[in-house]
Interface confidence: medium
């Protein structure tokens, strides 16, 4: 028996359902009584789901997996994984045994889009030319870790004086905070782009800074 899976990783959004495709070619006269099907985690060998002795043995993996029972006889051994979590990411192996035996692994890549960035300015009032201003770009609840880019209002990339931190919450999703420090006087529009590298999703935020003119000497 020859087992086939998709070579490309399956990309699934957090809290959605994912199908890990696996198929085999049944011989004429094949019946489900002949089928032994096992899905397991490739690295740890933990059992995920199985079909043996002519029946679905059910989920061994947090009760969130299912087969497609009506399609098994046609050679469809795909696994449905419900309410995907970050911790589900990894490689899954599909083992099929009828008379002989074959297996193949499929990768699950979990993703979550980042929120539209919120932009904050510090200080946010009494700005004067020459002041150092800190612009913070914050985007939330994404996965995997984001790539963050800054540019000016003309699209020219800004690379100096940027600090980016990313923190995972209890669900494994990342909150990203990127800080750009600029000297006011190079004021204008500053844009932050938070990219999800798996989804190729870009979330944009921008802020326009206008400095107040100084009078010399300062008026009392």
């Amino acid at each position: 028996v020859e087992v086939q899976v998709s070579e490309d990783p399956v990309v699934a959004l957090v809290d959605t359902d994912a199908t890990l495709r696996c198929s085999f070619s049944p011989e004429p006269g094949f019946s489900l009584a002949q089928l032994n099907l096992i899905w397991q985690l490739t690295d740890t060998k933990q059992l995920v789901h199985s079909f043996t002795e002519g029946r679905d043995q059910g989920s061994a993996y947090s009760n969130r997996t299912a087969l497609f029972p009506d399609l098994l006889v046609q050679g469809n051994a795909s696994l449905r994984l419900q309410r995907v979590r970050v911790t589900d990411e990894g490689s899954y192996t599909c083992f099929v045994s009828i008379q002989d035996f074959d297996s193949a692994a499929v990768s699950l890549q979990v993703a979550a889009p980042y929120s539209k960035p919120s932009m904050t300015l510090e200080p946010n009032k009494d700005l004067r030319p020459g002041n150092m201003v800190t612009i913070t770009c914050s985007s939330y609840q994404g996965y995997p870790e984001a790539e963050v880019f800054w540019k000016d209002g003309q699209g020219v990339p800004l690379t100096g004086n940027v600090t980016t931190s990313q923190m995972a919450n209890e669900r494994g999703l990342f909150d990203v905070h990127s800080v750009l420090r600029v000297v006011l006087g190079a004021n204008g529009t500053y844009s932050c782009l938070v990219r999800n590298p798996v989804l190729q999703q870009d979330a944009h935020g921008s802020v326009t800074i206008t400095g107040q003119p100084l009078t010399f000497p300062p008026e009392a």
């Epitope: 209002g153 003309q154 004021n187 204008g188």
Partner: antibody
Framework: EVQLQESGPSLVKPSQTLSLTCSVT????????WNWIRKFPGNKLEYMGY???????YYNPSLKSRISITRDTSKNQYYLQLNSVTTEDTGTYYC????????????WGQGTLVTVSA | DIVMTQATPSVPVTPGESISISCRSS???????????LYWFLQRPGQSPQLLIY???NLASGVPDRFSGSGSGTAFTLRISRVEAEDVGVYYC?????????FGAGTKLELK
């Protein structure tokens, strides 16, 4: 449709100040970056500088001591001043709108030829 | 400043032919965000420069798909398939990675 139109004297004497106006229609000069680019005889193009949507400026360091870009938002115009000109400043001057995300230089004025000569 | 080099001052071409125009930069224009900040302009006789290609390979609005851009971080090519009479003019590359933006010297496309 966005349109840019340069205007100003076509002849300037050496050591004097070259002053040009760019009049913008179809867009607000508080919404993008606005640039000056010039083309010398013989086809060489030089980026001169910009004024941003908030009024800040950038000048090409090769011109920094001589150039000033200003604007008048009420007229939706921006301006170029180049001091102490020489015959080397002869060329065609273009005003150009910068683009934020989708590519640079989609909108150019038709250009104005300025000759520096005694 | 980043130096842009267009080593071929002029290219004679017969209408219907395909042509490639090259440009080099003294520094890589590939940014870590995946964009390559290289632009191509065409200046037809008596006209202002027209944007053809932005970010190395993206066709600007209204530009025929006979034009295409490609390249690496420092070596770039503008390809015109099936050259037409209206393609005559001077082609400039420009870097948009750093201020001051800088241009190549131009390559003049002439009909044979």
């Amino acid at each position: 449709e966005v349109q840019l139109q340069e205007s100003g004297p076509s002849l300037v004497k050496p050591s004097q100040t070259l002053s040009l106006t760019c009049s913008v229609t179809g867009d607000s000069i508080t919404s993008a970056y606005w640039n000056w680019i010039r083309k010398f005889p013989g086809n060489k193009l030089e980026y001169m500088g910009y004024i941003s949507n908030s009024g800040s400026t950038y000048y090409n360091p090769s011109l920094k001591s001589r150039i000033s870009i200003t604007r008048d938002t009420s007229k939706n115009q921006y301006y170029l001043q180049l001091n102490s000109v020489t015959t080397e400043d002869t060329g065609t001057y273009y005003c150009v709108r910068g683009e934020r995300y989708y590519g640079y230089g989609a909108y150019w004025g038709q250009g104005t030829l300025v000759t520096v000569s005694a | 400043d980043i130096v842009m080099t267009q080593a071929t001052p002029s290219v004679p071409v017969t209408p219907g032919e395909s042509i490639s125009i090259s440009c080099r930069s003294s520094k890589s224009l590939l940014h870590s965000n995946g964009n390559t900040y290289l632009y191509w302009f065409l200046q037809r006789p008596g006209q202002s420069p027209q944007l053809l290609i932005y970010r190395m390979s993206n066709l600007a609005s209204g530009v025929p798909d006979r034009f295409s851009g490609s390249g690496s971080g420092t070596a770039f090519t503008l390809r015109i398939s099936r050259v037409e009479a209206e393609d005559v003019g001077v082609y400039y590359c420009m870097q948009h990675l750093e201020y001051p933006f800088t241009f190549g010297a131009g390559t003049k496309l002439e009909l044979k």
